[in-house]
């Protein structure tokens, strides 16, 4: 099937980094300089994505892949190939539209980006606060009250935290 | 709220040049990119060129290097310049924010070329 | 440079119903693509970015869809506030570069 077809069709013996030149009797070409092709007979090359203004390069173009952009210091991406950067913010902090804000009591955010968080209720598992929480770290839940009641005999491991944004105040 | 305030001489006559200022408030200006944009009356939407705060900028090669941009980070400021002006350089200029598309835009300032 | 071409240059439609414009590039942009709306005498705003993405505040009857060089915005219903002129814009490659724009109009 291969062989019938590339008789059909010289242009898919062409591999992926070249194109299927029509001016020079459909002989493969090397793709051009900022330019790739990632599978093989292609007619034209792509060209590349320039990692321009906040944008910075993480992984050159080759000819046979596009270039990937991030963002530069300070900032993050945002949507489908990194199309949009973000201010990073502080731990404890959020990004709101009059720039950086420590979260509110009661909310944290371990990250440089996204939004604060509501601390865990512990008490919702029956659990207690075994360590609070800040704005830079939820709280960690304990073993419940009656189990660090005198004659207890063993205490229980704490329980993983639930999603915090999953638990209401 | 990031708010982007521009200004700067709405009428021109031909060979002069044009100078605008743009002022962000609230949010960051380091960091970020700062562009222009502008629109002959009528018309579609060109972008003239970019400035980060450090200074380092990029601009459309059809304005031929007759634009300049500057910048003043202790007053989150950057400016446009564009020399030897003529009726086709008539349009609304605005100044952006650049994060990959264009998130916060000025309010645009008319500027005319007559003589 | 990569040029944008936006097509219908205007669209005539009943509050409502659906809108759908679209955008060519004159090559392959992945899906660095950013769709705005302007108002007269308005700056453009930011609707959608990453061709997809819609952008802070944005309702959800705008949609963005397509990727290397066809793209779609969709309004889904149009509001009255949705009447304007729409503009693609690639990020992909230097210089960036628009479209012409697409004016929706009261039909």
């Known amino acids: 099937f291969e062989r019938t077809r590339s008789l059909q069709d010289p242009c898919s013996n062409c591999p992926a980094g070249t194109f299927c030149d029509n001016n020079r009797n459909q002989i493969c070409s090397p793709c051009p300089p900022n330019s790739f092709s990632s599978a093989g007979g292609q007619r034209t090359c792509d060209i590349c994505r320039q990692c321009k203004g906040v944008f910075r390069t993480r992984k050159e173009c080759s000819s046979t892949s596009n270039a990937e952009c991030d963002c530069t210091p300070g900032f993050h991406c945002l949507g489908a190939g990194c199309s949009m950067c973000e201010q990073d913010c502080k731990q404890g902090q959020e990004l709101t539209k009059k720039g950086c804000k420590d979260c509110c009591f009661g909310t944290f955010n371990d990250q440089k980006r996204g939004i604060c968080r509501p601390w865990t209720n512990c008490s919702l598992d029956g659990k207690s606060v075994l360590v609070n929480g800040t704005k830079e770290r939820d709280v960690v839940c304990g073993p419940s009250p009656a189990d660090l009641s005198p004659g207890a005999s063993s205490v229980t491991p704490p329980a993983p935290a639930r999603e915090p944004g999953h638990s209401p105040q | 709220q990031v708010q982007l305030q521009q200004w700067g001489a709405g009428l021109l006559k031909p060979s002069e040049t044009l100078s605008l200022t743009c002022a962000v408030y609230?949010?960051?200006?380091?960091?970020?990119?700062w562009s222009w944009i502008r629109q002959p009356p009528g018309k579609g939407l060109e972008w003239i060129g970019e400035i980060q705060h450090s200074g380092s900028t990029d601009s459309n090669p059809s304005l031929k290097g007759r634009v300049t941009f500057s910048v003043d980070t202790s007053k989150n400021q950057f400016s446009l310049k564009l020399n030897s002006v003529t009726a086709a350089d008539t349009a609304v200029y605005y100044c952006?924010?650049?994060?990959?598309?264009?998130?916060?835009w000025g309010q645009g300032t008319l500027v005319t070329v007559s003589s | 440079e990569i040029v944008m071409t936006q097509s219908p240059a205007t669209l005539s439609v009943s509050p409502g119903e659906r809108a759908t414009l679209s955008c060519r590039a004159s090559?392959?942009?992945?899906?660095?693509l950013a769709w705005y709306q302007q108002k007269p005498g308005q700056a453009p705003r930011l609707l959608i970015y990453?061709?997809?993405t819609r952008a802070t505040g944005i309702p959800a009857r705008f949609s963005g869809s397509g990727s290397g060089t066809e793209f779609t915005l969709t309004i889904s219903s149009l509001q009255s506030e949705d009447f304007a002129v729409y503009y693609c814009?690639?990020?992909?490659?230097?210089?960036?570069?628009f479209g012409g724009g697409t004016k929706v109009e009261i039909k």
């Open positions: 952006a924010r650049l994060t990959g598309p264009f998130d916060y």
């Open positions: 609230g949010g960051s200006f380091s960091g970020y990119y």
């Open positions: 990453g061709a997809s």
């Open positions: 090559q392959s942009i992945s899906s660095i």
């Open positions: 814009q690639q990020y992909y490659n230097w210089p960036l570069t």
